[in-house]
Amino acid sequence: YSHWPSCCPSKGQDTSEELLRWSTVPVPPLEPARPNRHPESCRASEDGPLNSRAISPWRYELDRDLNRLPQDLYHARCLCPHCVSLQTGSHMDPRGNSELLYHNQTVFYRRPCHGEKGTHKGYCLERRLYRVSLACVCVRPRVMG
Amino acid sequence: YSHWPSCCPSKGQDTSEELLRWSTVPVPPLEPARPNRHPESCRASEDGPLNSRAISPWRYELDRDLNRLPQDLYHARCLCPHCVSLQTGSHMDPRGNSELLYHNQTVFYRRPCHGEKGTHKGYCLERRLYRVSLACVCVRPRVMG
């Protein structure tokens, strides 16, 4: 990164937390699933959100940790091992596998801080990489060489 | 969010920026594309990263803005309008559409700050939602009701 001059929030501690709360991945995406109208099943719907119309359909699973920022993360979970047939939208096609697309999300864990003499002094944020699944993708199986 | 006690970074201004730099979506994902081995084309490869094996293959396009945090964002760009046939991996099947999966990424823009009397006083971060495409997904076309 190029160097940026320091910015000017009024309270550094609160700002760090505030920014973090808002800068993380807001999944589920723009078009929310409507579970009552689109029951979770191994089929590709002809309407509804992208994750239910996909031939590698998926649902979102909440991962909540009150000692982590963001406290709420959503993981995609594939509803089928294979892809759904484009012909019918309901039968599976064994020529394709439904695979998760991952990324490493940076998260921050709340940890007790220790002062200069080892005394407990509030909480610090500890940065960690955390694997999150974004979606399921229909792929041709790998050819074993 | 539940209330967290304030945390204890040493310098608030630097910490805000440091946390932001690290908390955004690190795309391209875990398995990097190798463009020389897998030329970008409308076909589903039998090896390589997920975005080249997908029947809705995509490439990543860099979006760099030095006045934004994160400065680098990557957008998925579909390589085919339709899905690639699972039978061959090399010709299109018009029964399926290759659609982008979007999410609203929170970004922060660097803006000049103004002091109490309107004087220029360094830079502030302005939070904005920014639409990013994560991947391409093979979907059954919507049925128009």
């Epitope: 039968h91 096609d93 | 076909r43 039978q87 061959t88 090399s90 010709h91």
Partner: antibody, heavy 121, light 113 residues
Amino acid sequence: QVQLQESGPGLVKPSETLSLTCTVSGGSISSYFWSWIRQAPGKGLEWIGFIDYSGSTNYNPSLKSRVTISVDTSKNQFSLKLNSVTAADTAVYYCARQEIINFELNWFDPWGQGTLVTVSS
Amino acid sequence: DIVMTQSPASLAVSLGERATINCKSSQSVLYSSNNKNYLAWYQQKPGQPPNLLIYWSSTRDSGVPDRFSGSGSGADFTLTISSLQAEDVAVYYCQQYFSTPWTFGQGTKVEIK
């Protein structure tokens, strides 16, 4: 009735490139997929790869690094190039057509008569 | 790749008798979406190219005598010649067109006993 005819040199030296052409008569090369298949003496059939009229190709992974198939729609022909040949590439080489029905490729029909290519110095 | 295995490698049958050739695929070639088996049978006479006999595992190509029939589903298939004729002496191949790379069985040679 569509007919296919292979042509090209019957003898190729080791490490050189085998080049064959298939001429399609009695019909257009468009709207179909065109394959090369080979058969070593006394052996079974091995699919090499296919091309469609637009030039989209698909190769057998076992030969992919050495194969190029191209099409010339103006001449109603498609061609095979196989480089770095060895004695193991000695075979009868056939061209054949595949129809596409409901967006999927089907069986091979018809086939060319085949041409024997011998790899020898 | 889908591996196709034929048995027997060769078969000697008396004229007018039944000849049966088996073909197994390493994975199913039945597509449940259209309930079709992506399997074809070819006949190859000496010095000639293969000639299509049967497709979709059981549909005879036009002009193929009805003594030839195909059966089976999923991963196990059979080609039957109900009453062998002299002109049926040939090598027979099964082939899957379920997914690339297209693959053939190693062939079954049918002779007259």
